[in-house]
Interface confidence: medium
């Protein structure tokens, strides 16, 4: 039970996170104009990693893409680069944890190779968590040195919205809610590698118990083990049949919550 | 080179209308705010109308609201200014003005005016 | 409406003086003001914008200062050119507006 749902839980939040860090990735908002000493006739302006946008101050708003790779930063490069890796990753992640939840089950998959395969997701999360944080904290270090505002003039060729009046600019929504999808993304992927361990099948020695019966003598192995003759033998037991009690977390399973954000 | 050149004023008659323009170069009009700013002779400088740089939000002054119409054609490179019902106390030199960036209502480059005369 | 308060609104002075002009808004304007000149049959020019910003091209004699609602243009070293009227202008709020001008003139 505790394996499953740590498993299920893990998929839930990573599925949570990922959604996260697609949506941070596409928001407009990674950095905004800081409103704190801005006059009302100023046009808000609010930039992200594809385009810049502007808010007029009767409302309409205006966005405008980066409409070269060249003439942009390398750290905002990087931090597109970081996203969408986070992004593949996660995806990738979350396509082989499916298959490696216990409550699916496909053809005769061997609970070793679902763990292998809850590991693997488990370490993709965790990349993809890590991904995301790094470059969501990239951009965030970027505003914080004023890096945005030295390079806010290479953005005349990107639709020309140019900015000569020093504006001020703060961390947007979009930070927020990539540090956030992140945590998620690796806390679910940590959960993942957790629920690995509760998965692979313990290849225990037991110690044979001897019983003294009139004419052969018997090593009983207990619980789904087939028993084998020998006396005292202290040979590694395979598992035949899978009709031996069972776990309460291999009878019962929960059903993974799809979400997007 | 920026330059900003107006047109269309003259003489009318109060109750009249007039439309002025003001051709742009040298810069990428459709990036920045235009403005039309007014003075009357002898006197000060006076705001009449803000329009943004594209083209969606108009500001104007009171006196000068319902009455006067700004707009812009980005592929024309052209502000237009379109005037009704004139009064006397409109007559004035009509300057087109850029504004600094998209988003302040600083004018760095005006151009050489056009004169409104509004008499009878 | 924010009103601009220019004093003096004329001002004589010789070549070589350190001329000041004051602006004082009606309300706070933070540092949202701009500093024009204006020669006769021209048309203003930029010459300060976000009250103490010099604009590129302009001699770094002029400069201004202040916050709120007090603000001062100030031209260190008088030069002939620089006989000529100035106005200051806000844009923290609709509708813009001028001051009602100051005018420099040879002493």
């Known amino acids: 039970m505790a394996v499953t749902a740590c498993q299920g839980l893990g998929f839930v939040v990573s599925l949570i996170g990922i959604a996260g860090i697609i949506a941070a990735t596409c928001m407009d908002q990674w950095s905004t104009q800081d409103l704190y000493n801005n006059p009302v006739t100023a046009v808000f302006n609010y930039q992200g990693l594809w385009r810049s946008c502007v808010r007029e101050s009767s409302g309409f708003t205006e966005c405008r893409g980066y409409f070269t790779l060249l003439g942009l930063p390398a750290m905002l490069q990087a931090v597109r680069a970081l996203m969408i890796v986070g992004i593949v990753l996660g995806a990738i992640g979350l396509l082989v944890s499916i298959f490696a939840l216990k409550c699916i089950r496909i053809g005769s998959m061997e609970d070793s190779a679902k763990a292998n395969m809850t590991l693997t997701s488990g370490i993709m999360f965790i990349v993809s968590g890590l991904c995301a944080i790094a470059g969501v904290s990239v951009f965030a270090n970027m505003l914080v040195t004023n890096f945005w505002m030295s390079t806010a003039n290479m953005y005349t060729g990107m639709g020309g919205m140019v900015q000569t009046v020093q504006t001020r600019y703060t961390f947007g929504a979009a930070l927020f809610v990539g540090w956030v999808a992140g945590g998620l993304t690796l806390i679910g992927g940590v959960m993942m590698c957790i629920a690995c361990r509760g998965l692979a099948p313990e290849e225990t020695n037991y110690k044979a118990v001897s019983y003294h019966a009139s004419g052969h003598s018997v090593a009983y192995k207990p619980g789904g083990f087939k028993a084998s003759t020998g006396f005292g033998s202290n040979t590694k037991n395979k598992k035949i049949y899978d009709g031996g009690a069972r776990t309460e977390d291999e009878v019962q399973s929960y059903p993974s919550k799809h979400d997007y954000v | 080179e920026v330059q900003l050149l107006e047109s269309g004023g003259g003489l009318v008659q109060p109750g009249g209308s007039l439309r002025l323009s003001c051709a742009a170069s040298?810069?990428?009009?459709?990036?920045?705010?235009m403005t039309w700013v007014r003075q009357a002779p002898g006197k000060g400088l006076e705001w009449v109308s803000s329009?943004?740089?594209?083209?969606?939000?108009?500001y104007y002054a009171a006196s000068m609201k319902g009455r006067f119409t700004i707009s812009r054609d980005n592929s024309k490179n052209t502000l237009y200014l379109q005037m009704n019902s004139l009064r006397a106390e409109d007559t004035a030199i009509y300057y087109c003005?850029?504004?600094?960036?998209?988003?302040?209502?600083?004018?760095?480059?005006w151009g050489q005016g056009t004169l409104v005369t509004v008499t009878s | 409406d924010i009103q601009l308060t220019q004093s003096p609104s004329f001002l004589s002075a010789s070549v070589g003086d350190r001329v000041p002009i004051t602006c004082r808004a009606s309300?706070?304007?933070?540092?949202?003001l701009a500093w024009y000149q204006q020669k006769p049959g021209k048309a203003p020019e930029l010459l300060i914008h976000?009250?103490?910003t010099l604009q590129s091209g302009v001699p770094s004699r002029f400069s201004g200062s202040g916050s709120g609602t007090e603000f001062t243009l100030t031209i260190s070293n008088l030069q002939p050119q620089d006989f000529a009227t100035y106005y200051c202008?806000?844009?923290?709020?609709?509708?813009?507006?001028f001051g009602g001008g100051t005018k420099v003139e040879i002493k």
């Open positions: 309300q706070g304007i933070s540092n949202f």
């Open positions: 976000s009250a103490s």
């Open positions: 202008q806000q844009v923290n709020s609709y509708p813009l507006t």
């Open positions: 003005a850029k504004s600094l960036s998209y988003y302040h209502y600083y004018f760095d480059y």
């Open positions: 040298g810069f990428t009009f459709s990036s920045f705010a």
């Open positions: 329009l943004s740089g594209s083209g969606r939000s108009t």
